[in-house]
């Protein structure tokens, strides 16, 4: 159920260091800065709970403005292997080595982690995001080449006191921002090794983790504006549910996807969307400060809760899911995305649902808790919600197993 | 500022492909979908397909489905559109043009012209 | 398909004076109407979005208007850098669609 039990050590509640250590926007991911190497080289570093490797750029290219150079290190330590990371579209490769790793607004520690230096690449690198290397947050059955390289944060945990949790606050902006203002702006918090009562209001509730490779969770029920969905639940989960911070959009399997758009358009039907907003391709436009929030349904998903038959509810309103886009050419208006799309690769609870909330990936007790997020983008008349507990039963039917032989495809 | 530019006139004969580039530059690539559009003189403007260079996922005019493909090259922020079995049918201008709402952005023309 | 119909090939007009072009689509498209200029050898021009909504940069004497089947796009005091073919779009549902276009001609 809540957290309300005494305090771990490591959980003081207040990690004022850490608040504020995240910088960037949902459409083109968040980071922290790191440093890498002996001398320490500062890089900015994409958050990704979606994988399990911490990969960096080392070599020229059009969108870096800086990347890891191996050969001033005198800490660096090459282990003689390549990497390849290939993704439905694009890749990444590099090389694989160790090398001394430390966050400047995290705990003060210093690590030997492993560190795939990227040579290569296509479609991985975007350009204006303004990160150089990605840290794979996920557990070692995802990383890449194999699973016996363990992760950073395994690494972190392993070598430090640090408690073998995080948490994160990732803070849309509720409109767009330039490329100035992201780099001036605050864009969330990374939590590492435990939990700021700060961050978040109300309580927190945990769902299970499934299976330790993504953050892999179960939904047990899908509503729109408070209206059940009807699908078998398995649909929600098929071929799996994650947490990923390294994803835009809340992504659905195809069949929930188009039960939801039908349920929203239904739903907002006062105004007549073209065909491409609900695909992802047109934008929707109001003149300045008239964007009819409440004309668009809150979305809840239902999280298998820790204790038997029990579930909890986190809603999210249009806020999260209608993204603030900036276009020169409709610069008078408010402009917006629909950032629900459809997904091959089951449900990724990407930024527009972890806007909403302070999420706690407490990997030492297996479960993952979600608290209304202090930053959340809302409005005078809905806030974004988690609430429970709700009797819900059978939900073990609801997750999804995936045949063995395809366990090792890689999330995109 | 927000550009597309579109690769030079082409002179092709019936019976060949032609591939026309459409370079974007002034704003985050994949963010925003890319359109191709035909014009023959006198008929107007024709849709013919789209691709979101984020995931190249495409979808087509059915008209154009089998004369038309796009890709696409993250790295160079290049749009491609290949289109296969020349006629004198395919003679025209062909534009690249942005999505936002509508179309704000258009690439300045290539003119294709098939002959034997 | 929807079929956007301008019925209107040519329009004369003299400097000054205000000319309403319209257009008409087959189905509902609710306000997901566009319209582009275009001149001769040039490519298209972005106007008007969502019926009546101004593209950056675009001078106010053009206006838009109508829902549902029925468009026209104004132009008041007429210039003579005005004197184009004139295009409206729906990008209501796939495949988006043209009309035919009308040529703004001088008197």
């Known amino acids: 159920e809540t957290d309300e039990e005494p305090e771990e050590p490591g959980r003081r509640g207040s990690f004022v260091e850490m608040v504020d250590n995240l910088r960037g926007k949902s459409g083109q991911g968040y980071y922290v800065e790191m440093t890498v190497g002996s001398p320490p080289q500062t890089l900015n570093i994409l958050v990704d709970t979606g994988s399990s490797n911490f990969a960096v750029g080392a070599a020229p290219h059009p969108f870096l403005h800086r990347y890891y150079q191996r050969q001033l290190s005198s800490t660096y330590r090459d282990l003689r292997k390549g990497v390849y990371v290939p993704y439905t579209q694009g890749k990444w490769e590099g090389e694989l080595g160790t090398d001394l790793v430390s966050i400047p607004h995290g705990p003060n520690v210093t690590v030997r982690a492993n560190i795939a230096a990227i040579t290569e690449s296509d479609k991985f690198f975007i350009n204006g995001s303004n990160w150089e290397g990605i840290l794979g947050l996920a557990y070692a059955e995802i990383a890449r080449p194999d699973d016996s390289l363990e992760p950073f944060f395994d690494s972190l945990v392993k070598q430090t006191h640090v408690p073998n949790l995080f948490s994160l606050q990732l803070c849309g902006a509720g409109f767009p921002l330039n490329q100035s203002e992201v780099l001036a702006s605050v864009g969330g918090s990374m939590i590492i090794g435990g939990i700021d009562h700060s961050l978040y209001t109300g309580s927190l509730w945990y769902t299970p983790i499934r299976r330790e490779w993504y953050y892999e969770v179960i939904i047990v029920r899908v509503e729109i504006n408070g209206q059940d969905l009807k699908m078998d639940c398995k649909e929600y989960n098929y071929d799996k549910s994650i947490v990923d911070s390294g994803t835009t959009n809340l992504r659905l399997p195809k069949k929930v996807f188009e039960a939801a758009v039908k349920s929203i358009k239904a739903a907002s039907s006062t105004e007549k969307f073209p065909d491409g907003f609900w695909l992802g391709e047109q934008l929707v436009c109001w003149q300045a400060g008239t964007t009819p929030w409440n004309i668009f349904p809150v979305i809840s998903l239902y999280l298998m809760g820790e204790v038997t038959n029990q579930s909890f509810r986190i809603t999210i309103l249009p806020q999260q899911y209608l993204r603030p886009v900036e276009d020169v050419a409709t610069s008078q208006d408010d402009c917006y995305k629909f950032a629900i799309s459809q997904s091959s690769t089951g449900t990724v609870m990407g930024a527009v649902i972890m806007e909403g909330f302070y999420v706690v990936f407490d990997r030492a007790r297996k479960r993952i808790g979600f608290a209304v997020s202090a930053c959340h983008v809302h409005d005078e008349f809905r806030t974004a919600a988690v609430e429970g507990p709700f009797v819900t039963l059978d939900m073990e039917d609801c997750g999804y197993n995936i045949p063995q032989t395809d366990e090792s495809t890689l999330m995109t | 500022e927000v550009q597309l530019q579109q690769s030079g006139a082409e002179l092709v004969r019936p019976g060949t492909s032609v591939k026309l580039s459409c370079k974007a530059s002034?704003?985050?690539?994949?963010s925003y979908w890319i359109h191709w559009v035909k014009q023959r003189p006198g008929q107007g403007l024709e849709w013919?397909?789209?691709?979101?260079?984020?995931?190249?996922?495409?979808k087509y005019n059915q008209k154009f489905k089998d004369k038309a493909t796009l890709t696409v090259d993250t790295s160079s922020s290049t749009t491609y559109m290949h289109l296969s079995s020349l006629t004198s049918e395919d003679s025209a201008v062909y534009y690249c043009?942005?999505?936002?709402?509508?179309?704000?952005?258009w690439g300045q023309r290539t003119l294709v012209t098939v002959s034997a | 398909d929807i079929q956007m119909t301008q019925s209107q090939k040519f329009m004369s007009t003299s400097i000054g004076d205000r000319v309403s072009v319209t257009c008409k689509a087959s189905?509902?498209?609710?306000?997901?109407v566009a319209w582009y200029q275009q001149k001769p050898g040039q490519s298209p021009k972005s106007l008007i979005y969502?019926?009546?909504h101004w593209y950056s940069g675009v001078p106010d004497r053009f206006t838009g208007s109508g829902s549902g089947t029925d468009f026209t796009l104004t132009i008041s005091n007429v210039q003579s850098e005005d004197l184009a073919e004139y295009f409206c779009?729906?990008?209501?549902?796939?495949?988006?669609?043209f009309g035919g276009g009308t040529k703004l001609e001088i008197k």
């Open positions: 002034g704003y985050t690539f994949t």
């Open positions: 189905q509902n498209v609710g306000t997901n």
């Open positions: 013919i397909g789209m691709i979101d260079p984020s995931d190249s996922y495409t």
């Open positions: 969502s019926a009546s």
């Open positions: 043009a942005r999505s936002g709402v509508a179309f704000p952005y």
């Open positions: 779009q729906q990008y209501n549902s796939y495949p988006y669609t």
